[in-house]
């Protein structure tokens, strides 16, 4: 009995559900009463889930597995694994027995994205060119272990005195801390890239150090050079800092955040106290850090409409300002694929394949490709429509003449998150059966 599973590992994010695909070809007259299906861990042979004696025997794996019972009769023996954990990583074997017997193993690769690195500098006061400083880059709760790269403001690698440590927490997720010891030049940007090798995701943090004192008559206000990227619905920190002089007190401080283009007031701190949010009550200062020169703004429950430039004005005796850009993003959903017509297909037939992905931002890039990854640039029409929250739904239609058989894949790419959502449909010339979601 031929049992088919994917060649490539199934990659699943921690906390999401994964489908371990497995299929067989039922003969005419096949009934579920004849079927024995067993899923087990390949190495330890621990039972995961089984279907015997015509019924689902249930999960033997922390009650987190399920079969696609309504698809079993068509030969779909796939296993749904819920709330994936790091400990689930490994090989699962699908055993199918009817009259004959067959088995195949599928690998589950677990992954978790690393957080945007936070950067700290020690010492962080009274720096002069030639001083040695320690820059620490910390990124949290990723899997598997990260690769860490340091670079200057031009992207050139910094391969000097770097020490990187990675520690797994009780869920098996890694926190990474990388320390760069560097001798300061006149000024410089130091960036840390934390790469997840499975997700091919790069998390980026940077710090710009200007050792010489700012000229008198101006407060030097520092903000990140790169746009702050925030997911819709999450909180974002718009970083802004200044260097308080000895004897500085908050009574001397005037801090104003406003929208750069419209000059609309967002938040202010004047006359020694927080004047509160003037921006839909969704902003806050880090009041306990203000005296140390941290004028950053917390923006809660980010919306698409928040995207743009925010200016941080700081006035003590002197005055300074700088603008920071907020780039809003939302990941696109896994594309759903529809086929028209979807019955009695023959080579030479023209079909319309529609790929739909929802609630992303900004507008997506859509690519079609065949089963080998070669681009399909034929008759494609893509439309994107924003909903009332400004999130886009994308629909891309490919008209194609069928070959003997083929796989048609749609990649919906979020250009800001550099996230690719992938959907595919395989047409074999027989009546269609879609793979389960």
């Amino acid at each position: 009995l031929e049992v088919q599973v994917p060649e490539d590992p199934v990659v699943a994010l921690v906390g999401t559900d994964a489908t371990l695909r497995c299929s067989f070809s039922p003969e005419p007259g096949f009934s579920l009463a004849q079927l024995n299906l067993i899923w087990q861990l390949t190495d330890t042979k621990q039972l995961v889930h089984s279907f015997t004696e015509g019924r689902d025997q249930g999960s033997a794996y922390a009650n987190r597995t399920a079969l696609f019972l309504d698809l079993l009769a068509q030969g779909n023996a796939s296993l749904r694994l819920q709330r994936v954990r790091v400990a689930d990583e490994g090989s699962f074997t699908c055993f199918v027995s009817i009259r004959d017997f067959g088995s195949a193993a599928v690998s589950l690769q677990v992954a978790a994205p690393y957080s945007k690195p936070s950067m700290t500098l020690e010492p962080n006061k009274d720096l002069r060119p030639g001083d040695t400083v320690t820059i620490t880059c910390s990124s949290y709760r990723g899997y598997p272990e990260a690769e860490v790269f340091w670079q200057d403001g031009q992207g050139a690698p910094l391969t000097g005195n770097v020490t990187t440590s990675q520690m797994a927490n009780e869920q098996g997720l890694f926190d990474v801390h990388s320390v760069l010891r560097v001798v300061l030049g006149a000024n410089g940007t130091y960036s840390c890239l934390v790469r997840n090798p499975v997700l091919q995701q790069d998390a980026h943090g940077s710090i710009t150090i200007t050792p010489q004192r700012s000229p008198t008559g101006a407060v030097e206000v520092q903000v990140p050079e790169d746009p702050v990227v925030a997911l819709v619905g999450t909180d974002a920190t718009l970083r802004c800092s200044f260097s308080p002089e000895p004897g500085f007190s908050l009574a001397q401080l005037n801090l104003i955040w406003q929208l750069t283009d419209t000059k609309q007031l967002v938040h202010s701190f004047t006359e020694g106290r927080d004047q509160g949010s003037a921006y839909a009550n969704r902003t806050a200062l880090f009041l306990d850090l203000l005296a140390q020169g941290n004028a950053s703004l917390r923006l809660q429950r980010v919306r698409v409409a928040d995207e743009g430039s925010f200016t941080c004005f700081v006035s003590i005796r002197d005055f300074g300002s700088a603008a920071v850009s907020l780039q809003v993003a939302a990941p696109y959903s896994k594309p759903s694929m529809t086929l028209e017509p979807n019955k009695d297909l023959r080579p030479g037939d023209t079909v319309t394949i529609t790929c739909s992905s929802y609630r992303g931002y900004p507008e997506a890039e859509v690519f079609w490709q065949d089963g080998q990854g070669a681009p399909l640039t034929g008759n494609v029409t893509t439309s994107q429509m924003a909903n009332e929250q400004g999130l886009f739904d994308v629909h891309s239609v490919l008209r194609v003449v069928l070959g003997a058989n083929g796989t048609y894949s749609c990649l919906v790419r979020n250009p800001v998150l550099q996230q690719d959502a992938h959907g595919s449909v395989t047409i074999t010339g027989q009546p269609m059966t879609f793979p389960p979601e």
């Epitope: 403001g153 031009q154 992207g155 940007t189 890239l193 790469r195 050079e225």
Partner: antibody, heavy 122, light 106 residues
Framework: EVQLQQSGPELVKPGASVKISCKTS????????MHWVKQSHGKSLEWIGV????????TYNQKFKGKATLTVDKSSSTAYMELRSLTSEDSAVYYC???????????????WGQGTTLTVSS | QIVLTQSPALMSASPGEKVTMTCSAS?????MYWYQQKPRSSPKPWIY???NLASGVPARFSGSGSGTSYSLTISSMEAEDAATYYC?????????FGAGTKLELK
């Protein structure tokens, strides 16, 4: 569409200087660094250096320090490379090239200028 | 600096033939990048991060390797593949290229 349009061929005398331009369009100039690459006739590629248009920061190949100076003009989205004290060894095609990303490990150059041919001859 | 040595310097292949060229680094590098260049043209990105094909590159190309040893393979040579291929690293300064492998059609 991203484009990098370089200035035309140059014929200069030994000892002179030359300034090659690379005018960009189709993307935000300050969001990507700009690299310069030398290709001597029938030979391989040599990296000269890189400039960050956002703040003018530069990183050079030690071999070209003192030979090449990289600058930008943000208002016209143009990058420049000046080469000085020219000798016949500097005769080559010079390319400007934009990398895929500064914030990711994608260190490949996905857009290149058409090249500027420099001939140093008396 | 890291020296990249490409071999062979010159090779020829018939249509349909499998082709493999190598790039050896004098010190370990994290990732390798490859470019294709044809006469009187600028280089084109071909493979990034060791094994990923750049946009528009045919699926018959593949890249692999780690540490100091990397390779580019064409599963079935086609006429349009005749070109010079350069490897590139930027794991340490300065960024360096290999001397190139010139692939001709037999």
């Amino acid at each position: 569409e991203v484009q990098l349009q370089q200035s035309g061929p140059e014929l200069v005398k030994p000892g002179a200087s030359v300034k090659i331009s690379c005018k960009t369009s189709g993307y935000t100039f300050t969001e990507y660094t700009m690299h310069w690459v030398k290709q001597s006739h029938g030979k391989s590629l040599e990296w000269i250096g890189v400039i960050n248009p956002n703040n003018g920061g530069t990183t050079y190949n030690q071999k070209f320090k003192g030979k090449a100076t990289l600058t930008v003009d943000k208002s016209s989205s143009t990058a420049y490379m000046e080469l000085r004290s020219l000798t016949s060894e500097d005769s080559a095609v010079y390319y400007c090239a934009r990398p895929h990303s500064l914030l990711r490990l994608r260190r490949e150059f996905d857009y290149w200028g058409q090249g500027t041919t420099l001939t140093v001859s008396s | 600096q890291i020296v990249l040595t490409q071999s062979p310097a010159l090779m020829s292949a018939s249509p349909g033939e499998k082709v493999t060229m190598t790039c050896s680094a004098s010190s370990s590098v994290s990732y390798m990048y490859w470019y294709q260049q044809k006469p009187r043209s600028s280089p084109k990105p071909w493979i990034y991060l060791t094994s990923n094909l750049a946009s528009g590159v045919p699926a018959r190309f593949s890249g692999s390797g780690s540490g100091t040893s990397y390779s580019l393979t064409i599963s079935s040579m086609e006429a349009e593949d005749a070109a010079t291929y350069y490897c590139q690293q930027w794991s340490s300064n300065p960024l360096t290229f290999g001397a190139g492998t010139k692939l001709e059609l037999k």
